[in-house]
Interface confidence: low
């Protein structure tokens, strides 16, 4: 009766910096009593640890037990279904989970007005989940980069692209008076790792925040 | 992982006509910017007609009413019908996409798109 079920289809990870989600698509027909066994294994340690028994969701948060990723090289997950005493055959990640697999964010995006100029500040993120000397500036130490995305509102598709090197910027606006609207995505410069848009954020800018000068 | 394959490029004379095409693969996302971007050697890539997820297209001033970006879903391909080809049309076109929540407006200023295809060669002779 070992493996009289199906397999879970494709498992996988999708992690952005201290948030390692473990996913999985359902066996089909699928009953009401399915569950999911998960397991792990840390590369370099080669043995399969229990993670959790009977997950009735299609994914599991590994955040707690992933911690030290940043440190290590990796890891490799397992899921299997479970319904009673009959059981699946395991299905594992294709690729290792590694730092390279992590999605880059930013915390937020903190804009304001001086002289004409948007001065922008990118705030880091600071997960709870994160030990203390795990920071995001320690962990990507170099060759941060940001890419930055303006839209005038209105007007959809007028765009300005920038890449900055650092967390604060300035914009000039040329003069230009209206709503500005920016986002943001984060890079490495010496990584492959993906980056995520940020939620954009809108400041006014009026002609009370321009100054003449001779 | 998500890959782009570029096909349809060639050698055509001034007014003549082609269709680039686009496989796109590895990705289950619902929303997108998709476009098409183009280089000459030694100049920037530049941004020639973009699609969203919501149908919305956008064109580079220099290719309006001559070229027409459009994408099949159920094929999960992106195509750029290129028609009244000029020699300055000459060019390595790039499909590209970005991909998933959060991501800007599409337009064709827009080059900060996550993947990119390895290009296909367009040559147009007067």
């Known amino acids: 009766h070992g493996t009289e079920l199906p397999s879970p289809p494709s498992v996988w990870f999708e992690a952005e910096f201290f948030h390692h989600i473990l996913h999985w698509t359902p066996i089909p027909n699928q009953s009401e009593s399915t569950c999911y066994e998960v397991a792990l294994l840390r590369y370099g340690i080669e043995s399969w640890n229990s993670i959790s028994n009977c997950s009735q969701t299609l994914s599991y948060d590994l955040t707690a037990v992933t911690l030290d990723l940043y440190h290590s090289n990796g890891y490799r997950a397992r899921v299997r279904a479970v319904d009673g005493s009959r059981h699946s055959n395991w299905t594992v990640t294709n690729t290792r989970f590694s730092v390279d697999e992590v999605t880059l964010t930013v915390g937020s995006v903190n804009l304001e007005i001086h002289n004409g100029f948007i001065l922008g500040k990118i705030q880091l993120p600071r997960p709870k989940m994160a030990p203390a000397n795990d920071t995001y500036e320690s962990i990507f130490s170099h060759f941060r980069e940001y890419e930055i995305a303006i839209r005038k509102v209105p007007g959809n598709f007028t765009f300005t692209h920038k890449k900055v090197k650092h967390e604060n910027f300035s914009l000039l606006t040329s003069g230009e008076v209206g709503e500005f609207c920016v986002q943001v995505k984060p890079s490495v410069a010496s990584r492959s790792n993906k980056g995520m848009w940020s939620k954009e954020e809108c400041i006014s800018l009026t002609r009370q925040y321009f100054t003449v000068t001779n | 992982q998500v890959q782009l394959q570029e096909s349809g490029g060639g050698s055509v004379q001034a007014g003549g006509s082609l269709r680039l095409s686009c496989g796109a693969s590895?990705?289950?996302?619902?929303?997108?910017?998709m476009g098409w971007f183009r280089q000459v050697p030694g100049k920037e890539r530049e941004g020639v007609a973009v699609?969203?997820?919501?149908?919305?297209?956008s064109y580079a001033d220099s290719v309006k009413g001559r070229f027409t970006i459009s994408k099949d879903n159920g094929k999960n391909t992106l195509y750029l019908q290129m028609n009244s080809l000029k020699p300055e049309d000459t060019a390595m076109y790039y499909c590209?996409?970005?991909?998933?929540?959060?991501?800007?407006?599409?337009?064709?200023?827009?080059?900060?798109?996550?993947?990119w295809g390895k290009g296909t060669q367009v040559t147009v002779s007067s």
């Open positions: 699609i969203d997820s919501d149908g919305s297209t």
């Open positions: 590895g990705y289950t996302y619902s929303s997108y910017c």
């Open positions: 590209a996409a970005d991909l998933g929540h959060y991501r800007p407006p599409c337009g064709v200023l827009y080059l900060g798109m996550d993947y």
